[in-house]
């Protein structure tokens, strides 16, 4: 009970539960595909408890397994919009440092507007995330449909 | 048959507001992309807005970004163009056409001019 | 924005005449590209889509090529009601932009 007390006046960070729910800001200018980002308590449900944004990009502090989730709904889409527009594509990856560049998830819109995906994979800190949109559509900014986030799990 | 019948233009002083409609008969409504395209007398063809199935999502032209908002009733079967802020340059016919989607207009109203002068 | 350029200006043709219209694009819009109809007083008529995909209803004389940046549209034998102004238009980038159009007259 002590050790339950304890644990609710620390902060999230010092438990190593780092975590953030990220939704969308803006695209990049033409020939940067990235999406970025923007959390925190006053944009509503989003948040970063560890993790901190750097120029919209998602970097991680501490070492260890995260689940990774990304939601991308494409704004301006019916049902064969995106096969209209094929390929467009979306990837998440550790873009810098340089050396631990690696893709982690790669999805592609087919007959759909929403693709939804998550995996576990070892974060490490000073790792910086990025989300790649390539093709020619535009992705929603509504809250509910555009979402990225990552949750620590373990060490 | 697919009908598009645009209303809601005329003569308006600048600085002014209006209001165009588009009623839409023929198809499922609620399912297409819908845009406004309009045309400057003598002129080419400039889009203006697009607006996505469910009223959610919308994009607009620079020229018109901040001033006018485009928006559907889908239980009416309805677009709709709110033109505030309204210059000369805005003088035009405005056409409703439906997308294809894969963004080109496979339908197109006739058109309703808006002139706008003082 | 994408800028697309229309020549000539202007086509004067005799009916049963080949008409070939040249669009070029400021930058690649791969075959994101369609060609539209339109006639004094009515709304424009979708003639091609995706470069080279001919819309539902349009007779075979039209045809369109090309992707990249340099498309052309094709009447390859005038027929009196084909006089009118013709637009390209690319669906790649917001906004949507068109040509400033070719206008096809009676020689």
């Known amino acids: 009970q002590r050790f339950a007390q304890a644990q609710q006046q620390l902060p999230l960070e010092s438990l190593g539960w780092d975590v953030a729910e990220l939704q969308l800001n803006h695209t990049g200018p033409q020939q940067d595909p990235r999406l970025y980002w923007q959390g925190g308590p006053a944009l509503g449900r989003s948040f970063l408890h560890g993790p901190e944004l750097d120029k919209g990009q998602l970097r991680i502090h501490r070492d260890g397994i995260y689940m990774v989730h990304i939601q991308v709904t494409l704004a301006i889409c019916s049902s064969t919009t995106a096969s209209r527009h094929h390929p467009t594509t979306l990837a998440v990856g550790i873009c810098s440092p340089a050396s631990r560049s690696i893709s982690l998830l790669r999805l592609s819109f087919h007959q759909g507007c929403t693709i939804a995906s998550q995996r576990l994979t070892p974060l490490a800190r000073g790792d910086t995330l990025c989300t790649n949109l390539t093709g020619t559509l535009l992705p929603s900014r509504n809250t509910d449909e555009t979402f990225f986030g990552v949750q620590w799990v373990r060490p | 048959q697919v009908q598009l019948v645009e209303s809601g233009g005329g003569v308006v002083q600048p600085g002014r507001s209006l209001r165009l409609s588009c009623a839409a008969s023929?198809?499922?409504?609620?399912?297409?992309?819908m845009h406004w395209v309009r045309q400057a007398p003598g002129k080419g063809l400039e889009w203006v807005a697009v607006?996505?199935?469910?009223?959610?999502?919308?994009y607009y032209a620079d020229s018109v970004k901040g001033r006018f908002t485009i928006s559907r009733d889908n239980s009416k079967n309805t677009l709709y163009l709110q033109m505030n802020s309204l210059r000369a340059e805005d003088t035009a016919v405005y056409y409703c056409?439906?997308?294809?989607?894969?963004?080109?207009?496979?339908?197109w109203g006739q058109g309703t001019l808006v002139t706008v002068s003082s | 924005e994408i800028v697309l350029t229309q020549s000539p200006a202007t086509l004067s043709l005799s009916p049963g005449e080949r008409a070939t219209l040249s669009c070029r694009a400021s930058q690649s819009v791969s075959s994101y590209l369609a060609w539209y109809q339109q006639k004094p007083g009515q709304a424009p008529r979708l003639l091609i889509y995706d470069a080279s995909n001919r819309a539902t209803g349009i007779p075979a004389r039209f045809s369109g090529s090309g992707s990249g940046t340099d498309f052309t549209l094709t009447i390859s034998s005038l027929e009196p009601e084909d006089f009118a102004v013709y637009y390209c238009q690319q669906r790649t980038n917001w906004p949507l932009t068109f040509g400033g159009g070719t206008k096809v007259e009676i020689k």
């Open positions: 056409a439906r997308d294809t989607d894969g963004y080109d207009f496979d339908y």
């Open positions: 023929g198809f499922t409504f609620s399912s297409y992309i």
């Open positions: 607006i996505s199935y469910d009223g959610r999502n919308k």
